[in-house]
């Protein structure tokens, strides 16, 4: 019997359990850089000495065609930075192989712009969101997610890449930011702090949340991540803040309960498929959006960031598990893996709702100073 080649994935192609690193934000070269001089971090903003995760291994994705199985895991090589040798940058081997992108850390040498010049760009991420300065943009419709509900088999790869914990997502998870703005999810990863120290990447009115989830997507206009890097809208990241709540979050527990198995840097495990959308807030209609960059090297710009207004609640125990279980390089704890906020440099953050008049994660005065750039859409 001949194996029918599935367009998205089929046995003969990539292991259904997800061996090879598909596009991951963490697997994209990371996005975080040491705090920049023009945006001195507050004490909270300075990650400790730990080597923390970023958005590094974003593998390539093949176009969807009738003849060829696209989005098979093994067909998703990781992304090389410009000038790097054409070898997959699997995080497990980065530090040992000595490629340029492997030698970066949070809050330490070398300066990120030396690792990747794009890290010194003018339109970087993360940023501080000031709701009262956001431009209300009625054209920003509710996000649409399709295919995010996964059966338990095949299992998915959960990996400690030394900079974050990353879940490699299978083909077929489709996301639309609006008509004609369609993407495919590649991977998700988290950013966190340490005991008593919040670790979200984005902030709201200067407030840093305990943690943040990033779901990284590739535009359907591109077949490979490296083609999309630096192109406006080539990549899109859905970001949500994680906060402490009274109850255990059952969706997150499916991942957090497995962290002990991957405590060591470079280790990975397989976890049953789950409802990926359950890891995000339920309100897909209220969010902030702006164009920025990856928050770890190569810090490629043109990334569309969508930050949910609603937060996700995890129990105190779950947040502690997240920040206190994994180890990074050099026998250091994997903590405080966030980049300092970057200057907007004239960028206007758009809001899908009248944020200046409403309560967003951290409410402010009801003033709307900026107008929607996409008002004509």
């Amino acid at each position: 019997q001949r194996l029918p080649r599935m367009q998205e994935d089929s046995p003969l192609g990539g292991g259904s359990s997800g061996e090879d690193d598909p596009l991951g934000e963490e697997d994209l070269p990371s996005e975080e850089d040491s705090p920049r001089e023009e945006d001195p971090p507050g004490e909270e903003d300075l990650p400790g000495e730990e080597d923390l995760p970023g958005e590094e291994d974003l593998p390539e994705v093949k176009p969807k065609s009738e003849e060829e199985g696209s989005l098979k895991l093994e067909d998703l090589p990781t992304v090389e930075a410009p000038g790097d040798p054409q070898e997959p940058q699997n995080n497990a081997h980065r530090d040992k192989e000595g490629d340029d992108q492997s030698h970066w850390r949070y809050g330490g040498d070398p300066p990120w712009p030396r690792v990747s010049p794009a890290c010194a760009g003018r339109f970087q991420s993360p940023v501080d969101i000031r709701p009262q300065l956001a431009a209300f943009c009625p054209a920003l419709r509710p996000l649409e997610l399709l295919g995010f509900q996964l059966p338990p088999l095949p299992e998915l790869r959960l990996r400690n890449n030394g900079h974050s914990v990353q879940l490699t997502l299978p083909p077929g998870l489709e996301m639309a930011l609006g008509p004609g703005r369609e993407y495919r999810a590649l991977q998700l990863h988290l950013h966190w702090g340490a005991a008593g120290r919040p670790g979200s990447e984005h902030t709201v009115e200067g407030h840093r949340f305990p943690a943040e989830i990033h779901v990284v997507h590739l535009s359907t206009a591109f077949a490979r991540v490296d083609e999309a890097l630096g192109r406006p809208g080539g990549l899109a990241v859905l970001a949500a803040f994680l906060e402490e709540g009274p109850e255990e979050n059952s969706a997150y527990e499916q991942l957090l309960s497995r962290l002990e198995e991957i405590a060591e840097e470079g280790s990975e495990t397989q976890v049953p498929g789950l409802d990926i959308s359950a890891l995000l807030p339920s309100d897909f209609s209220r969010y902030f959006q702006y164009e920025g960059s990856l928050t770890t090297p190569p810090c490629a710009q043109g990334v569309i960031w969508t930050v949910f207004n609603q937060t996700v609640m995890l129990s105190a125990k779950q947040l502690h598990t997240l920040s206190d279980t994994l180890w990074g390089p050099g026998d250091s704890r994997l903590q405080l893996n966030f980049r300092a906020t970057q200057p907007l440099n004239g960028r206007v953050i758009e809001a899908s709702f009248p944020a200046g008049v409403d309560s967003s994660p951290r409410a402010a005065e009801p003033v709307q100073l900026n107008s929607c750039l996409a008002a004509g859409d």
Partner: antibody, heavy 119, light 110 residues
Framework: QVQLVQSGGGLVQPGGSLRLSCAAS????????MSWVRQAPGKGLEWVSA????????YYADSVKGRFTISRDNSKNTLYLQMNSLRAEDTAVYYC????????????WGQGTMVTVSS | QSVLTQPPSVSGAPGQRITISCTGT?????????VHWYQQLPGAAPRVLIY???NRPSGVPDRFSGSKSGTSASLAITGLQSEDEADYYC??????????FGGGTKLTVL
């Protein structure tokens, strides 16, 4: 060539046991979750059991829970179904199938093996 | 009784278009899980016809298409041919931790 070759079917008395085997070739067996699906004579398809790629997680239909055991030997590229306390209603053609598709589809099927439970 | 409901039989003349429905509940199709379709020719093992609601494996003619909406899904076959005569099954996943099938639909080409 991608294929799943089954063996082990036959006639067994009620209360008896039988072990089905499914030998995989042409694809990296150890990377894929696998399932057993059965089809009673003249009836439709019924999922029986599933196992993760590394064998660490198993799933069973309520109708066989506690009686059937799914297992795999990745070094031999072989999937097994140990069937105990067999009943007349277990009579069916049993197919092994590959859970290789991320969307939850079974994309490679064995040729099927007949299990008849009768006194 | 099957978890997913299909009509027992459908028929059509060569060249015609037919559809086969598959109705589930809020714990399977309605929960967001994908629907897959299989064709089983007499005496043979099933083969995937449509996966992920509307994707065709290579080798499957574009006369076959799938769609999904709410708690139901459907398989459409256009330009019906005699070799399409077979049993067709829909399949999804259910929150009860099981993979579920429809009862099957016998397609007769008149």
């Amino acid at each position: 060539q991608v294929q799943l070759v089954q063996s082990g079917g036959g006639l067994v008395q009620p209360g008896g046991s039988l072990r089905l085997s499914c030998a995989a070739s042409g694809f990296p067996f150890s990377s894929y979750a696998m399932s057993w699906v059965r089809q009673a004579p003249g009836k439709g398809l019924e999922w029986v059991s599933a196992i993760s790629a590394n064998g660490g997680t198993t799933y069973y239909a309520d109708s066989v829970k506690g009686r059937f055991t799914i297992s795999r030997d990745n070094s031999k590229n072989t999937l097994y179904l140990q069937m105990n306390s067999l009943r007349a209603e277990d009579t069916a053609v049993y197919y092994c199938a590959n859970n290789g598709n991320y969307r939850g589809a079974f994309d490679i099927w064995g040729q099927g093996t007949m299990v008849t439970v009768s006194s | 009784q099957s978890v997913l409901t299909q009509p027992p039989s459908v028929s059509g003349a060569p060249g015609q278009r037919i559809t086969i429905s598959c109705t589930g509940t809020s714990s399977n199709i309605g929960a967001g899980y994908d629907v897959h379709w299989y064709q089983q020719l007499p005496g043979a093992a099933p083969r995937v016809l449509i996966y992920g609601n509307n994707n065709r494996p290579s080798g499957v003619p574009d006369r076959f298409s799938g769609s999904k909406s709410g708690t139901s899904a459907s398989l459409a076959i256009t330009g019906l041919q005699s070799e399409d005569e077979a049993d067709y099954y829909c399949q999804s996943y259910d929150k009860s931790l099981s993979w579920v099938f429809g009862g099957g639909t016998k397609l007769t080409v008149l």
